[in-house]
Each structure stands twice: as C-alpha cells, then as structure tokens.
Interface confidence: medium
C-alpha cells in the first residue's frame, strides 16, 4: 500500500565462511531522499525506546559515514533508489537477518534480508531430464545459489572423474530477483555412459576444489550385442556346419525377445541365442546378425558375412556394346558366380582360346569385322574351374566392302545403246538396302543394284555407284568409254585471215569437236563432187570458179558426220566486160539506143565509166548508157570501165552504127 516503502532484493542470500556476499537492492522512499542508513545484524525492536537494537554493521548519517568493521561492509547505494550492499569477507556469524534501517526527513523503514553463511562451501545441484535415451541430446544443468563480484568461482563437469570435453556454458545472475551461478552442458549420451557418475565440481578462481554434486546416469538403450561364429573367419565350403552365438553385453531395460536375420530378413523359428547351420549350401552365404529387443527398441549385432565357398558356376558373357561399329571399342565381361571370386579367366573366340586374356574384362580398342563371332569364357578359383557358358555373339557392323561398278554390256558401248551396270560388293553388315549412283540421271533401276541407261549419250563418261547399309561405300568411277561418230563437224577457213581475193592461196580446215574412236577419215565435196580426203583443202591460187558451197565429212568406225554447207566467196576485180547494145549495134537515128556495160565482178561493180572512140570519158556513170534520140554523130566505137573494191576492168570497143532515117535521106 502507499504507506509502505517499496524494496526489491533476493529474499535470502547464501555464502560461506571467507567468501563474500553481494546484495542487489533497490528501494523507493515514501518522501524525499534518504537521510540516514543503518545496517543491523539481527535487529530487535525495543518498544521501550521505540528503536532497534542489534549489532550495527554499517551506519551513515547526514554528517557522513561512520567507519565500521574496517570497510568489510559497504553500502553501494544512493539516497533515492539503490540500496545494494557488499560484505567481504563474510563470516559464519554473519548468518541471520540483516536489517536495513532507512530514514528520510519524515519517514522510517526497516527492511529485512536473510543471510545464510555456511561453514564450508555448499555443493551445487545437478538437474537431469526425467529420462535419458542413448544418442538423444540432453542438457545437464549445475546450479549454485551463489555469486559475488569479489569472489570468483567456476563450475566444472566430470564424467567418472575425468573432465568432460564438451563445452559448458556458464552464466551468473546478480539481480534483485535472483543470485546464482549456473553451468549448462549439452551432451549426447551413448549406451556405454549408462551407470556412469557425472560430477559438477565447484572450484575457486585458482581451480581449487570447494564442493561438488554427483549423479549416476541412467541411459536407456537398446540391447548391445556381440556375435561369435565358428569357424571364426566365417568362411566354409558347401556341406560344412556353422554355429553363431549371440551375447548381450548391455540392455536397459532388460531384453524381451531374440531373433536372427540374414541379409536383413528374419529367419523363421530361430529365437534362441544360438544359430546352428548344418550342411550349408552356397545359397546360405550372406550377412547374418542377431536382433534382441527391449522397451526402447531392437538392438542388432554386427553382421557376420558367411561365405560359403564354391567353384565358379557356368559363365555368361556381357558385351558392351553389340552390335559394334567397325573401328569402335568393345568390352567383354565374364560373369560367373563363385566364392572366392575367380582369380583367372580363359576367354574363347569362336571356340578358340584367346591367349593373353586372363582378366574378368577384355577390352578391344579397335574392332575389326573379323572380331565378330561368339565370345565365351571360363572362370577359375581355388575350388575349381567353372563350365563355359553359351557365350555371347558380337555383331560387327561395317560399311559395304570392296564396292565395284560393273558394266554388263559387251564392249564397246556405242552412243544410243542401252547400257546396264551393276553395283557389286564383297561383304556388308548389315545387309545392303539401297544403292546410289553418280552422276544422277533420269535412269531406270530395274532391280536393286542394277542401273539401266537407255539411249546412252556420247558424253556419259564415268559412272560410280555406292552400296549402302547404315553407311554408303562408293566404288571408283568406271569409264563407260561410249563410242560415237565425230561431233560438231564444221568448215573453218584457215587462210587468208581476211576475205578471199582471186589469186590468193586459200586453206580450209575440216574441224570436229570430238570423236571416239579417235581414228577418223575426211572427205571434202563441192556440189556432190569429191575434192579431197585430208583434213585440209588447199588452193594455191584461188579463182572465181572455185567459189561455191563446200562440205566436209568426218568418218570413224561408228559413223560419219557432215558439216553444214560452207560458201566460199572469191572477190575479184571486174572481168569479162563487154558493151552490149540494144536494140542492136545498128540503130536508126531518132530512135533510142541503150548501151549496157556487162561484167563479172565480186563484189559487183560499184562505179562505171564510159569512153568514146577518142578515149574521151563520157559524163555517164551508170551501167546503162541511154542515147535518145540517137544521132548519126553518135556512131562510133564505145567502151566501158567497171570498178569495184578489188579493182578495175575495161571492155573491148563495141561499135554503134547510127544510120539515117528515110526522112533524112528523103530531104537530101
């Protein structure tokens, strides 16, 4: 209530002779600051004097502190909040009640605190969980109701008198609520810790023993077992006997049931501590253990590996991988059940021993087609040699081998023939399923691996085939060697390089692009007349009469080919000029007379010149000279000259006679 002073501090403090006591304390006075403080030991209220009697351990007044007991007792408080005290050292006779007499200006209060000082250091207290099970982590707590700044202590954990290696966590409390020192140890007990003594030892700062507390661990655990086997190495041969004994070395609580397991599976009707196996077979090889249960659970012994030895069983071969591709690597594994494991292997390829191969595995780094076949093996151990099993088949796959393109036709092949080719191969695995041909053409494949070329071209030079399974193998190309008549026959002028003029030396060449066979004959003809049988036709001095349409023929054993007609043109100056007169060379005056300059020229005459009997050129330049009306004076000899790009030519004189008309004669 509001009429009380309010104090907070531990109710009782514990210490021992020679230690110290630290009393954490807070207060709140009813009014104003503290003016007087007296610490009594076992105070008694005197009704007569209305004061407290008792030993004064400490006193302070407004006038200042009064020394008491050479500062053994210290008031560490203040005038309004803190009332903490320290007694150092503390003595056995300090036990009892401490009275804090507090006075303010108007109010007084006596606060009592119990002090329990023992003759010797009192022991700490170990706290354990209600149940401890093996391998489950627990926290062990050691608690001491003591802590003082002036008197350091330590708590150490021991197991069977030996310091425990686990790290403990120590904490202290010096508060108005509690004063203690506590050590906590996290610990995973094993079954072997059952019944062991754990100690918490109180030590001073120098590690000197002060006191301790001990507990005995009760670690609940499954039964711990030992298995014994006769023979001790647990290696026997078929038909031998084996005895196994199970011994319980520890169980908490007591065990209830016993059983035996082989390879993790319980053996029926085996519920005693002894397992007798008579006339063992290889099937009884395995891992044996005994299992004993209690309320915590089942406990298992270590496993005994019983090895029933026997000679290798018939072997099998495992191939990695079949089918194998030529050039790849392959591994064979010989598998044979045996105990002890086989020490030696004999390998067979197609029934024939493979020397130098005595290991469980055979590795072939580069497989070839002839490696194909049946691989078998025989395993051997100290008890004997196994039988050779059926073996495994190695299939070696490879592209078709020795592929050839074969021409089926009789030779030679002629242009236009039907050619049949076949694609042959020596061996293939897997089987050939298709064929390819080069070059590609719109050709017929009447059956697998056969190619028919209808109307074979002159330029079908080589053909190659490929036989294909999973891979294609190409044959070398085969030459068809198609024979054909000469091709692209044409006439070519070799000389002269420019146009041909009359009198030139002229050579014509009969050209062709190809011929098979190469042996050829030539024929030249003009207007159906044979001119020569050489590749060239030569004219030492060409004349206009040689002009015309020429052809050459080239022959081989297959046939003959003609060129297109080639026109030979000879250029020459005007020749064979003559003057023709129309209507005749005798014309009556007054009529019309036409003189024509006729000529033979190549190119044609481009320019004419007319001359009279006096070789006087006339002002006429066309081919025809027209005199109209013709006069008697026109009578005389005329000639003409023709000119072309090659040259000039002149005609002989032609005489025109103009006679008088009857009228003129009549007038005379």
């Amino acid at each position: 209530d509001s009429s009380k002073w309010v104090f907070e501090h531990p109710e009782t403090l514990y210490a021992w002779e020679g230690a110290c006591v630290w009393i954490p304390c807070t207060y709140r006075a009813l009014d104003g600051d503290l003016e007087s403080f007296i610490l009594f030991h076992n105070p008694e209220y005197n009704k007569n004097t209305s004061k407290f009697d008792g030993t004064r351990l400490y006193e302070s007044t407004k006038d200042g502190k009064v020394p008491s007991e050479q500062k053994r007792v210290q008031f560490l408080g203040d005038k309004n909040k803190n009332c903490t005290l320290s007694i150092h050292p503390v003595h056995l006779n300090d036990s009892g009640q401490l009275g804090l007499r507090m006075e303010s200006k108007t109010e007084k209060w006596m606060e009592r605190i119990h002090l329990n000082v023992s003759e010797r250091p009192f022991p700490p207290h170990i706290q354990l969980p209600p149940e401890i099970q093996e391998s489950q982590e627990v926290t062990l707590t050691c608690l001491l109701n003591f802590s003082c700044y002036g008197y350091p202590i330590q708590l150490q954990w021991l197991l069977e008198g030996v310091p425990m290696r686990q790290a403990a966590v120590t904490s202290t409390s010096l508060t108005i609520k509690s004063v203690f020192t506590r050590s906590e140890l996290k610990f995973s007990p094993q079954w072997s810790h059952h019944g062991k003594i754990v100690t918490c030892q109180l030590q001073d700062a120098d590690g000197k023993f002060l006191s301790n507390d001990t507990v005995q661990l009760n670690v609940k655990h499954t039964p711990k077992l030992e298995i014994k086997v006769t023979p001790s190495d647990a290696i026997v041969r078929e038909g031998d006997s084996v005895t196994m004994t199970c011994e319980v070395s520890s169980s908490n609580p007591e065990y209830t049931t016993v059983s035996w397991l082989k390879d993790g599976t319980s053996l029926k009707k085996q519920n005693t501590f002894t397992l007798n196996l008579r006339e063992v077979t290889k099937d009884q090889s395995g891992k044996y253990c005994c299992q004993v249960s209690n309320d915590v659970g089942p406990g298992r012994s270590e496993e005994v590996f019983l090895q029933v030895q026997y000679a290798p069983e018939p072997s099998t071969v495992q191939i990695l991988h079949s089918p194998a591709v030529e050039g790849s690597q392959v591994e064979f594994l010989c598998m044979s059940l045996a105990n002890p494991l086989p020490t030696n292997y004999t390998w067979y390829h197609n029934g024939k021993e493979m020397q130098g191969r005595t290991e469980e595995k055979v590795h072939i780094p580069k497989i070839l087609p002839w490696h194909a076949g049946t691989y078998s093996c025989v395993a051997e151990n100290i008890l004997g040699t196994g039988q050779r099993g059926p073996g495994a088949e190695l299939d070696v796959q490879y592209p078709p081998k020795k592929v050839t393109t074969v021409i089926q036709n009789p030779m030679p092949i002629r242009e236009g023939d039907t050619v049949t080719l076949s694609c042959n191969y020596n061996s293939s695995n897997p089987s050939v399923t298709r064929y390819e041909w080069k070059p590609h053409g719109a050709w017929e494949e009447p059956s697998l691996g056969v190619l028919k070329i209808q109307n074979v071209g002159w330029d079908n030079t080589t053909i190659a085939c490929a036989a294909c399974n999973s891979w294609c193998s190409w044959a070398s190309p085969v030459a068809l060697n198609v024979q054909y008549a000469p091709r692209d026959v044409r006439v070519r002028k070799i000389k002269p390089l420019s146009e041909i003029h009359s009198g030139n030396s002229v050579s014509l060449q009969c050209d062709f692009s190809s011929s098979h066979p190469k042996e050829v004959q030539f024929f030249w003809e003009k207007n159906g007349r044979l001119l020569g049988k050489e590749s060239q036709l030569n004219f030492d001095s060409i004349s206009p009469e040689d002009a015309g349409s020429y052809s050459c023929w080239v022959n081989n054993s297959i046939g003959q080919t003609a060129s297109k007609a080639w026109t030979l043109e000879v250029l020459y100056a005007p020749r064979r000029l003559r003057v023709s007169m129309s209507p005749g060379d005798q014309v009556m005056e007054g009529k019309s007379a036409t003189l024509t300059c006729e000529s033979d020229a190549n190119p044609p005459v481009s320019h004419y010149t007319w001359f009279d009997w006096n070789n006087q050129s006339l002002p006429y330049h066309s081919q025809k000279l027209r005199l109209e009306p013709v006069k008697v004076q026109h009578s005389g000899a005329y000639w003409c000259q023709g000119t072309n790009s090659v040259g000039k030519g002149r005609s002989p004189l032609s005489t025109l006679t103009v006679y008088y008309s009857p009228e003129t004669i009549g007038r005379r």
Epitope: N344, G356, T358, W370
Partner: antibody
Framework: QVQLVQSGAEVKKPGASVKVSCKAS????????IHWVRQAPGQGLEWMGW????????NYAQKFQGRVTMTRDTSIGTAYMELSRLRSDDTAIYYC???????????WGQGTLVTVSS | DIQMTQSPSSLSASVGDRVTITCRAS??????LNWYQQKPGKAPKLLIY???SLHSGVPSRFSGSGSGTDFTLTISSLQPEDFATYCC?????????FGQGTKVEIK
Amino acid sequence: QVQLVQSGAEVKKPGASVKVSCKASGYTFTGYYIHWVRQAPGQGLEWMGWINPNSGGTNYAQKFQGRVTMTRDTSIGTAYMELSRLRSDDTAIYYCTREDTWNYIDYWGQGTLVTVSS
Amino acid sequence: DIQMTQSPSSLSASVGDRVTITCRASQSISSHLNWYQQKPGKAPKLLIYAASSLHSGVPSRFSGSGSGTDFTLTISSLQPEDFATYCCQQSYSTPRTFGQGTKVEIK
C-alpha cells in the same frame, strides 16, 4: 617396352642336349603364350611348340615329340626350351616368341644359334 | 597339319613397283593368317595379322587380303628397305605352320 632376351650361342656334339633360355620383360609374363620357332641355315621357319606360362601347359609339334621339353619359371619371367638327342640337322637359330591374343607373333627374341657338330 | 604354299618363291622388282605375293592354305583357315618380313641375320617382323590388319608402325604401302584358303600380300610401291624375305603363317590351329617364304630381290 616388351623384350625377349635369349641365352647365347651353343656348340654341341651329336647326342647331347641343349637348353635355351628366354627372359621376358615389359609385360605380364603369365598373360601370353611363348612359342618356339627355329630356322635352319638358308631354310624357312619351323614351329616347335608352345608353353602357357600361367599354367605350365605345353603343346609340341609331332616332329619334336619326345625330344623337346618346354618349361618356365614365373618368379623370374623366364621360359626354357630343352632339345635332347641332338643331330646335325638340328643346327639352326632357335627363336622364342610371344603370341598375342589374336594368335599372331608380335615379338621375337634375338635368336640363339645352336650348332651340332662332331 | 595345315600346309601353307607361297608363290612365287622369289621375284625381282624395281623401286616403285607394285608387288604381289600369294599364300594358299591346304584347308580353310578363315582369316587367321599372318605375314612376316625377315632380313638376313635378323628375326622376322610382323607386317599383317588376321589377313588384312596392319600391325602398328608398319607403312601403309603394305596391305593384305583374302580369307578361307587364298591370301595376298601387296606392296603398292616398293621401297629400297622392302627388299627382304616375306613369309606367311597360319594361326588357325596347332601346329602353327609357315609358308616357305618369298625372296624379293632388286632387279
């Protein structure tokens, strides 16, 4: 590297015996058969027989049956060929050889010349 | 016993020539045929095994073919170091047997 080193040349009298040794190195001695082949002067190669160094098993050519003995000592990796009742036509170079898994002779000793002469 | 017959017993050739040696077995030996080269005063050396497989380190100008009873050793372009005696051997069965050899001489 694989090596087959043979003992040195021998000169023997007719009726005597000769024992040629062959020291193998560079491979597992017990893993490969040892074959013995001989070559008379100016003649071709003649197969005499084999020994399996692993088991000690042997196989002799009919011609040498009863006269030839092939043995081995695995502790020192050595094969031996002993030919008894020597005749002058036994004069030859004797080769020890190693036969591979696929039955071809891949390594030959340097040869031992045995001369039988009275 | 399986008889091995080689032909020719000798041949003369020039550097660069293509040379072919044949070997015939008296019964089928599948592909269990090996070829060896021997030079005077030296031990034979393996060239070809299993009829057509080139032994490691042997030049590719050497090749083998055949199966059953007829086998061929071919040297595509004869080199100066190839003048020697060549011998075939069957490894199909015991006793192992050799051909009588073919001597390749310089023409």
